[in-house]
């Protein structure tokens, strides 16, 4: 059985202010059961960007249908990007529990924001 991997394919993504940014992530296994969460930054101060199962994230939408059976694509799209969104984003797999336990993080994708074309 292969070890669970969280694949963030791109090292960096550059987006113009006002556009949408797609951050790609896929997991190699549905097991163990548990959600994917997206964070900006690392450590205790990291910012939750998206939780697959709970919360309200108005600017963030999943790229793939999250209700689709056996879906392992956890890519997200963030709309209306501003310079404040710049940073490194991590796709993190959790094991379901009370609380959920962090299992594996992707390698991270750095989002840089270009000035809006005039």
């Amino acid at each position: 059985e292969e070890e669970l991997q969280v694949i963030q394919p791109e090292k960096s993504v550059s987006v113009a202010a006002g556009e949408s940014a797609t951050l790609n992530c896929t997991a190699t296994s549905l097991i163990p059961v548990g959600p994917i969460q997206w964070f900006r930054g690392v450590g205790p101060g990291r910012e939750l960007i998206y939780h697959q199962k709970e919360g309200h994230f108005p600017r963030v939408t999943p790229v793939s249908d999250p209700t689709k059976r056996n879906n392992m694509d956890f890519s997200i799209r963030i709309s209306n990007i501003t310079p404040a969104d710049a940073g490194t984003y991590y796709c993190v797999k959790f094991r379901k529990g009370s609380p959920d336990v962090e299992l594996k993080s992707g390698a991270g994708t750095e989002l840089s924001v270009r000035a809006k074309p005039s």
Epitope: Q5, I7, Q8, P9, E10, K11, A27, T28, G108, T109
Partner: antibody
Framework: DVQLVESGGGVVRPGESLRLSCEAS????????MTWVRQAPGEGLEWVST????????YYADSVKGRFTISRDNSKNSLYLQMNSLRADDTAIYYC????????????WGLGTLVTVSS | ALTQPASVSANLGGTVEITCSGG????YGWYQQKSPGSAPVTLI????NRPSNIPSRFSGSTSGSTTTLTITGVQAEDEAVYYC?????????FGAGTTLTVL
Amino acid sequence: DVQLVESGGGVVRPGESLRLSCEASGFTFRNYYMTWVRQAPGEGLEWVSTISDTGDTAYYADSVKGRFTISRDNSKNSLYLQMNSLRADDTAIYYCAKSWIWWTFFDYWGLGTLVTVSS
Amino acid sequence: ALTQPASVSANLGGTVEITCSGGNSNHYGWYQQKSPGSAPVTLIYADTNRPSNIPSRFSGSTSGSTTTLTITGVQAEDEAVYYCGGSSTGDGIFGAGTTLTVL
């Protein structure tokens, strides 16, 4: 055993069209992204196009965008590449490849079919 | 773009490393082609994963922006062209290929 069998290659003139097919077996075709990769004579591998598992999303190399169309029929376990406005530099062996979890990785390949564009 | 050496050589039974670097990829794969026009074979995908039909003498590792294919106990049949592949769609996906000559 996973098998990918390409067909439809041949000799055509510049500007003409050709449709390649790839018949898949040995895995659940509808669950995987599929890809076309080509290799011109004496050259390296070049990614051409990829299609999502459901067929609703397609990706193309700049060199073929607007001329080639990838499609699939999951009921027939088949992948297709419609090639229009063919040019001499499209001459290559075209391989069908099964994409792994992330679509730029490939775990199985077909034997290929040769497309020659010549006047 | 993904950069790899045009050629490397190895002694029969020895160990050889082929490197690939650059591009915007976090992960890499390796593909073997024994002769021009023959079907490529996947050796490694996503850095370290080896398909079940691939001998254990082939292994992959990635550190930072560089990925390495290691062949331990090189066999005569390993003489081939080896292509690295990236995970980022903007990389063109494949390197130019490295020809391995077995001495």
